[in-house]
């Protein structure tokens, strides 16, 4: 995209004048831009996972589905668990909105959250004893 020049009247985030509170519309644009049918990777992966429901009504979004690895090891070609490899979660840091209080349902704070979106198979870290 083309870099647009900043309006000189706009304060920088480092500025003491930068607003601590902003008004945000919760009507999301392009919500379905990546709309796709749910894949079955969670079953076909060599490090399969299950999806667990995490609901928190004080958060926006309230419901987040998180991945939990099914095995410690990975699944080999025969469908058996191989403990020479490890299943580990793939974690993504996301920003959510946290309600400031139950009595102020339209006032939020930004909060960082670490969410597991799937699992992958890795070689284990081997510690050699001296």
């Amino acid at each position: 995209g083309i870099a647009m020049p900043r309006n000189p009247g706009c304060p920088n985030a480092e500025d003491k004048n930068f607003p601590q509170n902003v008004k945000v519309s919760l009507n999301i644009l392009n919500k379905s831009v990546n709309s796709r049918r749910p894949s079955d990777y969670y079953n076909r992966s060599t490090s399969p996972w299950t999806l667990h429901r995490n609901e928190d009504r004080e958060r926006y979004p309230s419901v987040i589905w998180e991945a939990k690895c099914r095995h410690l090891g990975c699944v080999n070609a025969e469908g058996n668990e191989d403990h020479h490899m490890n299943s580990v979660p793939i974690q993504q840091e996301i920003l959510v909105l946290r309600r400031e209080s139950q009595h102020c349902p339209h006032s939020f704070r930004l909060e960082k959250m670490l969410v597991a979106v799937g699992c992958t198979c890795v070689t284990p870290i081997i510690h050699h004893m001296a």
Epitope: R53, E55, Y60, S62, W65
Partner: antibody
Framework: EVQLVQSGAEVKKPGSSVKVSCKAS????????IHWVRQAPGQGLEWMGV????????FYNQKFDGRVTLTADESTSTAYMELSSLRSEDTAVYYC??????????????WGQGTTVTVSS | DIQMTQSPSSLSASVGDRVTITCRAS??????IDWFQQKPGKAPKRLIY???DLASGVPSRFSGSGSGTDYTLTISSLQPEDFATYYC?????????FGQGTKLEIK
């Protein structure tokens, strides 16, 4: 206009399975989960489970002991509830209801009209 | 599972009466209560969410209150269309459970 339209009444034999559909319209299907609730004749409401059409995630009431399978087809905005190993006590009206993932204070705001399932030999 | 016990299970009242339905949770580990109204042969309709808040299009004669294990639905002045069965639902502990219902009948 938001609508959840369910499939028609079913009569099933004990031991068989039933699959009820719930077609959604009037909103973005993947922004909402679909929950399933049933009501036996003259009884109260019983939560069965939830399906997230976006991720494919499911969570069930353990009371149903693996007999319930919830799925969704994003291409047709339709959710499905399959109940296997039917017994007479599964005779009930089965409802689908949507549940906002963005703000679950908006949970269960719209319901399907209900599907009557009768299990009888 | 958390059991939700509604009382009374049935209630006779007249148009204009003030009516209170209570819902008690078997433990206090719940976040909120939602209330639903159901008429014969129809799907439930959400009345109150998050214990206190009125759902869209619901008349202001309905109100909700409570905390911990005890919750209340109040109808300040009964109207003919309010005769129905009312259910509470606990949110925050799985599986989410409904009360057994309170049938409100015309006296």
């Amino acid at each position: 206009e938001v609508q959840l339209v369910q499939s028609g009444a079913e009569v099933k034999k004990p031991g068989s399975s039933v699959k009820v559909s719930c077609k959604a319209s009037g909103y973005t299907f993947t922004d909402y989960e679909i929950h399933w609730v049933r009501q036996a004749p003259g009884q109260g409401l019983e939560w069965m489970g939830v399906n997230d059409p976006e991720s494919g995630g499911t969570f069930y009431n353990q009371k149903f002991d693996g007999r319930v399978t919830l799925t969704a087809d994003e291409s047709t905005s339709t959710a499905y509830m399959e109940l296997s190993s039917l017994r007479s006590e599964d005779t009930a009206v089965y409802y689908c209801t949507r549940y906002s993932k963005w703000d679950s204070f908006d949970g269960m705001d719209y319901w399907g009209q209900g599907t009557t399932v009768t299990v009888s030999s | 599972d958390i059991q939700m016990t509604q009382s009374p299970s049935s209630l006779s009242a007249s148009v204009g009466d003030r009516v209170t339905i209570t819902c008690r949770a078997s433990s206090g580990i719940i976040s909120y209560i939602d209330w639903f109204q159901q008429k014969p042969g129809k799907a439930p309709k959400r009345l109150i969410y998050a214990t206190f808040d009125l759902a869209s299009g619901v008349p202001s004669r309905f109100s909700g209150s409570g905390s911990g294990t005890d919750y209340t639905l109040t109808i300040s002045s009964l109207q003919p269309e309010d005769f129905a069965t009312y259910y509470c639902r606990q949110v925050g502990s799985y599986p989410e459970t409904f009360g057994q219902g309170t049938k409100l009948e015309i006296k």
